[in-house]
Interface confidence: medium
């Protein structure tokens, strides 16, 4: 059997025998275009493609539509993988989405969606989610049904206001909704009573800004 040299996601990399977490090169589906991503090969059986990470406030997440489309940051630290790649990938087969959260008191929680995909750019990378389980709230902190993606220069929310400008960061804002993992990073002891922080309402409430977040995807049949 010929050895696989290009990979669409971290699950394919894991199955090829590369089982060490780190930065790998992924290839867009049906294309030769490449993108660098961090692969978590340990958590929950491995094979996770990290599509978002916040951990220290080192990267500015108040970015343009184009930046959220192509991705920004550093895969070894804080970054956004890119809406276009994630949209193309999640429309090829069924993916699960796991969102791992840390607060400032040493607690951790997660939300797992059994089916996740993003619509195309023409449909504003609208998020589609089904089947929530996990410890970060029994109700989805990403509004259902899913909303279009909004950025500071691409206002697609359901608010008279501009959620992305008011709350900062690109996200699937409603009006403005119970979450924003791309909000302002507040250091410890500045992380409460902040309306524009890193929010996951059904775990920590509206004014609490989280210490760390990771969004990761993996094929449902992994």
């Amino acid at each position: 059997k010929e050895e696989q040299t290009t990979f669409r996601d971290c699950a394919e990399i894991f199955k090829s025998g590369l089982t060490t977490s780190g930065i790998y090169t992924l290839t867009f589906p049906n294309s030769t275009e490449e993108i660098k991503a961090y692969c978590d090969m340990e958590a929950g059986g491995g094979g996770w493609t990290i599509i978002q990470r916040r951990e220290d406030g080192s990267v500015d997440f108040q970015r343009t539509w184009k930046e959220y489309k192509v991705g920004f940051g550093n895969p070894s630290g804080e970054y956004w993988l890119g809406n276009e790649f994630v949209s193309q990938l999640t429309n090829q087969q069924r993916y699960v989405l796991k969102i791992h959260l840390k607060d400032w008191e040493g607690n951790e929680a997660y939300s797992l969606y059994e089916h996740f995909y993003l619509s195309s750019e023409e449909l504003n990378y609208r998020i589609h989610l089904k089947g929530l389980t996990g410890t970060a709230g029994k109700i989805s902190s990403i509004s259902q049904p899913g909303n279009d993606f909004s950025t500071k220069d691409g206002d697609n929310d359901k608010c008279i206001c501009k959620c992305s400008q008011m709350l900062t960061g690109g996200w699937w804002f409603d009006a403005c909704g119970p979450s924003n993992l791309n909000g302002m990073y507040y250091p410890q002891r500045q992380n409460t009573n902040k309306f524009n922080g890193i929010k996951w309402y059904y775990w920590k409430g509206s004014g609490y800004s989280l210490k760390a977040t990771t969004m990761m995807i993996r094929p449902a049949d992994f």
Partner: antibody
Framework: EVQMVESGGGLVQPGGSLRLSCAAS????????MSWVRQAPGKGLEWVAN????????YHVDSVKGRFTISRDNAENSLFLQMSSLRAEDTAVYYC?????????????WGQGTLVTVSS | EIVMTQSPATLSVSPGERAILSCRAS??????LAWYQQKPGQAPRLLIY???TRATGIPARFSGSGSGTEFTLTISSLQSEDFAVYYC????????FGQGTKVEIK
Amino acid sequence: EVQMVESGGGLVQPGGSLRLSCAASGFTLRSYWMSWVRQAPGKGLEWVANIKEDGSEKYHVDSVKGRFTISRDNAENSLFLQMSSLRAEDTAVYYCARDMEASAGLFDYWGQGTLVTVSS
Amino acid sequence: EIVMTQSPATLSVSPGERAILSCRASQSISSNLAWYQQKPGQAPRLLIYGASTRATGIPARFSGSGSGTEFTLTISSLQSEDFAVYYCQQYNYWWTFGQGTKVEIK
């Protein structure tokens, strides 16, 4: 009486390194966040770095990230700032400051400062 | 970064008179503002925090007000020991200082 005494400043060439120390007394260091704040000659104040009570959280201003590292030794009641790849713009009086309880970055006691001069 | 702008840069006041110093934040910082006094060759001294709360041992002639983006430090009757440089500082999102206001004898 709360007291903080900085040391370790001096003249250093661009690209060089220095380690600043702050000896604290009159309070229990392990109960407080601590910070370094600097002041360039004739200029205003700039927060540089701070560190949680047990050393598990550290923050640095963007202009010094990757070059400066804050640390502490609670057993010795000491705070440190390791500075490397020094630049002319790092020339300043460096103060160690105690963060007021329950509010990071609000400085209720300061040392008298130590002067760092970066020049060839 | 939140930018703090103080005005005026220099304030000339006679002893016994009132001094009013202003500080503006580039975005809302709620009441997370402090004022410090610094005399030549000395370290800064905390005067006011929470925009209006006097620190321990600070005389009642010092008062602070404001919230959001506009703040004021008032010294009701200037004493000789009050002539110094005053800095405002926000601690709402990271930590930044204003450029200072020098209060000098008129």
